[in-house]
Amino acid sequence: SGVFQLQLQEFINERGVLASGRPCEPGCRTFFRVCLKHFQAVVSPGPCTFGTVSTPVLGTNSFAVRDDSSGGGRNPLQLPFNFTWPGTFSLIIEAWHAPGDDLRPEALPPDALISKIAIQGSLAVGQNWLLDEQTSTLTRLRYSYRVICSDNYYGDNCSRLCKKRNDHFGHYVCQPDGNLSCLPGWTGEYCQQPICLSGCHEQNGYCSKPAECLCRPGWQGRLCNECIPHNGCRHGTCSTPWQCTCDEGWGGLFCDQDLNYCTHHSPCKNGATCSNSGQRSYTCTCRPGYTGVDCELELSECDSNPCRNGGSCKDQEDGYHCLCPPGYYGLHCEHSTLSCADSPCFNGGSCRERNQGANYACECPPNFTGSNCEKKVDRCTSNPCANGGQCLNRGPSRMCRCRPGFTGTYCELHVSDCARNPCAHGGTCHDLENGLMCTCPAGFSGRRCEVRTSIDACASSPCFNRATCYTDLSTDTFVCNCPYGFVGSRCEFPVGLPPSFPW
């Protein structure tokens, strides 16, 4: 959106005559009609596609035109437009004689025209005026013109809308190209995010206004980088809130019980690692191939059925061994000793020797697959048609019958209002008969999913063991407040069990 401005400066008609050569009586009471239209290689008298404007009578015969209002008309003349400025134009300026007070076209005699000029060319948006002078046999017109953007419109074509604001929806001013320039202390695409105090912990701190650092539950300190341990924790520390991770040799809910069962009893067998986990309790971490509370039981590696093609598995000290049936070999009996001479290809498949006849490969006819062409292909099983298209088997080929609004071999192309991806923030676009509709992801709303809304992060019940869940509305995250006897960011660990052993 913008305005084409035309400033009439001086009109000279020394002899006071009309275009026909007839003199005006008593003088030429002159007013102007202006027609602005798209660029034409040959300017023609047709409709004024960009707009028209008329002046009142500005003077008689020869006169200068003031820069302000003259006889009720504005100078410069304003020709507003509400489209992208194309950068080119055609301009027609007509000077007319008004014998009376009625300036309507139908009220004037056809020979009341004094002069008519037409120009065309390129014109970029800008503040600078272009000065021009057009002379005919009897008249001369001096004028200047320019194109400027309307308020809140920017860019080379006045096509970018930007309105400065300093409220909940954004804190910014507009640059000359229409891009946003955040006010000090604000960031983000729409300058909605405050810039917190320098060094404020990214996850554990937040702010609702610039240079602030507010701590989330369980964190403390000027920069919210110190966790708050479990209340009453004695010989322990925390790495996440409400933890009480005991120092070496200490146990109990508050790390006030001495425990060192591993050192005194060495309960773990077969080279397992022992961890103290409470008063007179321990945990053994077994080496591969062992299981049991104390890692006393040996695992059989044949339990996973590693041998293929009917091979039988035998346990060995250093692993296992596969005994292959006739026709197969390899570590897992995965290789076939069959050749093309055994006619292994079904359904008309052609056999090709490989590795000097030691192996083979089947080339399957259309509609069959598998290493021996033993499987029939249903071309529709892979569901190749996108966007709800219906798959139709057509002999050796297939085709997709597309839903309205889609096209392409696999209905992969939109032919709809959704083609320009109008839904913000990952919203899903649905074509409707009279437009489109956006289905927004959690946390967003509005006709185009452009409005961010808060999510109840606790809605999915992320905390275990009857812990209390708190939602932080400014970041849409949760914090779990653990009951007595449990720790962890979700209160998932009984006290004393390290997080690396989730049983």
Epitope: H38, S44, P45, G46, P110
Partner: antibody, heavy 121, light 111 residues
Framework: DVQLQESGPDLVKPSQSLSLTCTVT?????????WHWIRQFPGNKLEWMAY???????HYNPSLKSRISITRDTSKNQFFLHLNSVTTEDSATFYC??????????????WGQGTSATVSS | DIVLTQSPASLAVSLGQRATISCRAS??????????MHWYQQKAGQPPKLLIY???NLQSGIPARFSGSGSRTDFTLTINPVEADDVATYYC?????????FGGGTKLEIK
């Protein structure tokens, strides 16, 4: 080359509305041309009715302005003519046409084959 | 409205001869040094076809046998030499003043 195809009803009752569609192929109706409706009466007299410029600007024959409108659907590359309160005098062959607006405004270089509409009770 | 009067209403010309069709406007169709007069050919059962635009400019694909001239209110379409394929009705049209108008047509036949 630009191609145009008219479609619409063969028969309309007096006082009803006549709606015609022109489908344009091989040229976008939003690029550099103007798109017209012209009708030819049974005696072969031609009358220019209206046009829609590529920018969306519309222009009508003043004698029809009170009962005519021209619109477009850019997604389908179609433009439409709506003529209200028809009488038997409106029976004609209706043509849609296109002109290169920057080079020869008013000279219509591309024409459809025409569609005949009869107003009768 | 500008009224366009074509003459003659019908014309019979021998093959290879010159055909001249006249179009007179009720007022000038000149603007900015151009005459906004155009000529069309219409064969039976077909839409009109643009031959000449702005008085004398030959439309792309039209043979040079067709030419146009004139200014202000008097205009002429000339076909020289006439061929059998030229049998049609010829219309003039102005776009200088609203509404755009057509002439009544001249029917060309072969003698």
């Amino acid at each position: 080359d630009v191609q145009l195809q008219e479609s619409g009803p063969d028969l309309v009752k007096p006082s009803q509305s006549l709606s015609l569609t022109c489908t344009v192929t091989d040229h976008s109706i939003t690029s550099g041309y103007s798109w017209h409706w012209i009708r030819q009466f049974p005696g072969n007299k031609l009358e220019w009715m209206a046009y829609i410029h590529y920018s969306g600007y519309t222009h009508y024959n003043p004698s029809l302005k009170s009962r005519i409108s021209i619109t477009r659907d850019t997604s389908k590359n179609q433009f439409f003519l709506h003529l209200n309160s028809v009488t038997t005098e409106d029976s004609a062959t209706f043509y849609c046409a296109g002109s290169d607006y920057s080079a020869n405004e008013g000279a219509m270089a591309y024409w459809g084959q025409g569609t005949s509409a009869t107003v009768s009770s | 409205d500008i009224v366009l009067t074509q003459s003659p209403a019908s014309l019979a010309v021998s093959l290879g001869q010159r055909a001249t069709i006249s179009c007179r406007a009720s007022e000038s169709v000149d603007s900015f040094g151009n005459s906004f007069m155009h000529w069309y050919q219409q064969k039976a059962g077909q839409p009109p076809k643009l031959l000449i635009y702005r008085t004398s400019n030959l439309q792309s694909g039209i043979p040079a046998r067709f030419s146009g001239s004139g200014s202000r209110t008097d205009f002429t379409l000339t076909i020289n030499p006439v061929e059998a394929d030229d049998v049609a009705t010829y219309y003039c049209q102005q776009s200088n003043e609203d509404p755009w108008t057509f002439g009544g047509g001249t029917k060309l036949e072969i003698k």
